[in-house]
């Protein structure tokens, strides 16, 4: 039997991708391993090769179909296995019955753009990517703004408790460079987590007009 501690964590992006990370203390770096997906009620199965991301963890993406195709539903269960080559055979190292809509992590929001900017405020919009139509409007967002001289970790989180793909940032300083990020999370799923943060959007507020404040 395998010794050491192990963790096998996967998330579904709600459309056609399951991303997995497997960590195993004492595992050999040069061992060839893969994740195999075996749905309970579908004719396909899928495999991806685990690639090292650190000393003792590996990751891969199970591509189930075209990016916007709805490959799984709320009733699906996919048995996921980590298989590692041991001589001439494949050995099962980890196994889980994966309920995709209980383990959601969406893609980061995309297409961030400044809709309107003034001296003290800025209106920003974005789009969600590869999100299932099943969610309808059952999504929430978190946003953060990077101010000069601060880090992202210090930035206060702004929560949008509904599917609102825009925000109006207020009380900004005139003629100042900022960066903005947003992430998304479905309300559904016991183990659902936030998407990665979007790519930062840089913007600059307008300078205050001489003698008056806009």
């Amino acid at each position: 039997a395998v010794n050491g501690t192990s963790q096998f964590t996967c998330f579904y992006n709600s459309r056609a991708n399951i991303s997995c990370v497997w960590s195993q203390d004492g595992a050999l770096q040069d061992t060839s391993c893969q994740v195999h997906a075996w749905p309970d009620r579908r004719r396909w199965n899928q495999t991806c090769e685990l690639l090292p991301v650190s000393q003792a963890s590996w990751a891969c993406n199970l591509i189930l179909g075209a990016p916007d195709s709805q490959k799984l539903t709320t009733v699906d269960i996919v048995t996921l296995r980590v298989l590692c080559r041991e001589g001439v055979r494949w050995r099962v190292m980890a196994i889980q019955d994966f309920k995709p809509f209980e383990n959601l992590r969406l893609m980061a929001p995309i297409s961030l753009q400044v809709v309107h900017v003034e001296t003290h405020r800025c209106n920003i919009s974005w789009e969600i990517s590869q999100a299932s139509h099943y969610f309808e409007r059952h999504l929430e967002f978190e946003a953060r703004t990077l101010s000069p001289g601060h880090t992202w970790e210090e930035a206060p989180l702004l929560t949008l408790k509904q599917k609102q793909e825009w925000i109006c940032l207020e009380t900004l300083t005139p003629d100042t460079q900022y960066e903005f990020q947003v992430r998304v999370k479905p309300l559904q799923g016991e183990f659902t987590t936030w998407s990665p943060w979007s790519q930062p959007l840089a913007f600059r507020t307008k300078p205050a007009a001489l003698g008056k404040d806009t």
Epitope: A1, V2, T5, S6, Q7, F8, W38, D40, I77, T79, R81, V82, R91, V92, M93, A94, I95, Q96, D97
Partner: nanobody
Framework: QVQLVESGGGLVQPGGSLRLSCAIS????????IGWVRQAPGKQREGVSC????????YYADSVKGRFTISKDSAKNTVYLQMTSLKPEDTAVYYC??????????????????WGLGTQVTVSS
Amino acid sequence: QVQLVESGGGLVQPGGSLRLSCAISGGTLDSYGIGWVRQAPGKQREGVSCMSRSDDRTYYADSVKGRFTISKDSAKNTVYLQMTSLKPEDTAVYYCAAVDAYGCSLVQPTTYDFWGLGTQVTVSS
């Protein structure tokens, strides 16, 4: 080679209880993911309950949730399945199975490496 031996099956009336045991020899219980799988006459094998080796997390089929409980005694190298509020549809041969991996599966019983010979459970009045 790991060997699994089930016991505790029998005839019980609807609403009754049974406790199945699975004694493991040739290996350490804590080294395996363990599952209970049943097969009714003319039906496919169905995962009933399993216990993950990595963290002792337990899983149950919807049909038995709240009625069956899986547990283990590492000192005795034995896994148990406590079955309560039994129904006629629970009638089946119950197998203990083990997989040399982290985690376990209810959905795909064929992933198990080692199997016992089974114990018959009959629920009838």
